[in-house]
């Protein structure tokens, strides 16, 4: 099956973070090139990354059209310099990807603490609302726009002098927590989509501590 020098792609893998979505596969081509096709379950195939020697293809533009759809991709192998050549069945060799539903499966990117402000014994911590490549009415949507209340943030906060991490949760991008007067605290946030069964958590944000430039302190 296939022409003498052509091998089918294998290990097709979706790599997706905050909807930036790339299909990767093996092997590195030797005397062959690849073309990728993508479709929804009910849709037509659309070709991307024509006759490439890469082993990845950015499919973001296609999946952001409807992130709740389930997508399937396939990678075709052609002999280099003879892309009209087909396999023994009259078709070029191809391999199917696993199905991919961006809304359920895209990894949550590392969040960033935008700011924190202390007023007396309260601290307001704000998480940056990261922009995605999902568009609506010609504007890019934020992570919160896309996921709405499905997305929560978990805040870990602790006294600089201790190791135990307290937690708070929000389905906005802001936390208001109680702190002890005169104590310095450190903060880290994690994005979570509790309704998922996989890829529920992001990596933790960089740790930010009071007394550093991101914060603001006001004694009341």
């Amino acid at each position: 099956s296939g022409t003498t020098n052509t091998v089918a792609a294998y290990n097709l893998t979706w790599k997706s973070t905050n909807f930036k979505t790339i299909l990767e596969w093996e092997p590195k081509p030797v005397n062959q090139v690849y073309t990728v096709q993508i479709s929804t379950k009910s849709g037509d195939w659309k070709s991307k990354c024509f006759y490439t020697t890469d082993t990845e293809c950015d499919l973001t533009d296609e999946i952001v059209k409807d992130v709740k759809q389930t997508y399937l991709a396939r990678v075709f192998s052609y002999p280099a310099g003879n892309v009209e050549s087909t396999g023994s069945a009259g078709e070029p060799l191809y391999e199917n990807s696993p199905e991919f539903t961006p809304y359920l499966e895209t990894n949550l990117g590392q969040p960033t603490i935008q700011s924190f402000e202390q007023v007396g014994t309260k601290v307001n911590v704000t998480v940056e609302d990261e922009r995605t490549l999902v568009r609506r009415n010609n504007t890019f949507l934020s992570l919160r726009d896309v996921f709405g209340k499905d997305l929560i943030y978990t805040l870990y906060y602790w006294k600089s002098s201790s190791s135990g991490k307290k937690t708070a949760k929000t389905n906005t991008n802001e936390f208001l927590i109680d702190v002890d007067k005169g104590e310095n605290y450190c903060f880290s946030v994690q994005a979570v989509i509790p309704s998922r069964t996989v890829n529920r958590k992001s990596t933790d944000s960089p740790v930010e501590c009071m007394g550093q430039e991101k914060g603001e302190f006001r004694e009341i």
Epitope: I152, T154, Y156, S163, G164, K165, K166, T167, A168, K169, T170, N171, D178, Q190, V192, P194, S195, T197, V198, R200, K201, D204
Partner: antibody
């Protein structure tokens, strides 16, 4: 099917140590949080502490701080409670529970418990 | 830490009775309150989450409500399998805390 199974309980002398295990199946612990809760004989529920196995972050109740340590081995899908300097008042059934992690739901699945008796 | 004061500590009731258990939080906990049922020798089971939502598989005779920092668990018509101990719990702040429990016994 989600399951949590505790083990490692038993009789130990005051000042001794014990390590409890909480083996999870039906879900991946690094996607959730694991809590330990204990119940002294004939008494109510007392929260002991939690771990986020994804990053190793923990918090322990004041009553066990410095004596108990919660850890996790994600490759074994198991959480642990290391108990040192045990006292008679630590005698209890120890439960591990899964934290669903939403604003609304916290401890949705519990293990069957393991009895720790501290006595000379 | 937030205290959850549960009352009564025990009550006697008959099958078919309407039973009400209350829990008062020492400060605002929003709706981050759960109710658990525990039978002797068994682990607690989640009944109500977010103050008033029935957990999956729990009979509809159980309900929860909130009024400020007061939380109520109601069993509309007590069944034989409902004789157990009930606990409230807040998870609004760390550490989460439980009420002292209410034992529902057969009259």
């Amino acid at each position: 099917e989600v399951q949590l199974v505790e083990s490692g309980g038993g009789l130990v002398q005051p000042g001794g140590s014990l390590r409890l295990s909480c083996a999870a199946s039906g879900f991946t612990i690094s996607d959730y949080w694991i809590h330990w809760v204990r119940q002294a004989p004939g008494k109510g529920l007392e929260w002991v502490g939690f771990i986020d196995p994804y990053n190793g972050y923990t918090y322990h109740a004041d009553s066990v701080e410095g004596r108990f340590t919660i850890s996790a081995d994600t490759s074994k899908n198991t959480a642990y409670l290391q108990m040192n300097s045990l006292r008679a008042e630590d005698t209890a059934v120890y439960y591990c529970a899964r934290d669903y992690g939403s604003l609304q739901v916290q401890l949705d699945y519990w293990g069957q418990g393991t009895l720790v008796t501290v006595s000379s | 830490d937030i205290q959850m004061t549960q009352s009564p500590s025990s009550l006697s009731a008959s099958v078919g009775d309407r039973v009400t258990i209350t829990c008062r939080a020492s400060q605002d906990v929003n709706t981050a309150v759960a109710w658990y049922q525990q039978k002797p020798g068994k682990a607690p089971k989640l009944l109500i989450y977010s103050a008033s939502f029935l957990y999956s598989g729990v009979p509809s005779r159980f309900s929860g409500s909130r009024s400020g920092t007061d939380f109520t668990l109601t069993i509309s018509s007590l069944q034989p399998e409902d004789f157990a101990t009930y606990y409230c719990q807040q998870h609004y702040t760390t550490p989460p805390t439980f009420g002292q429990g209410t034992k529902v016994e057969i009259k």
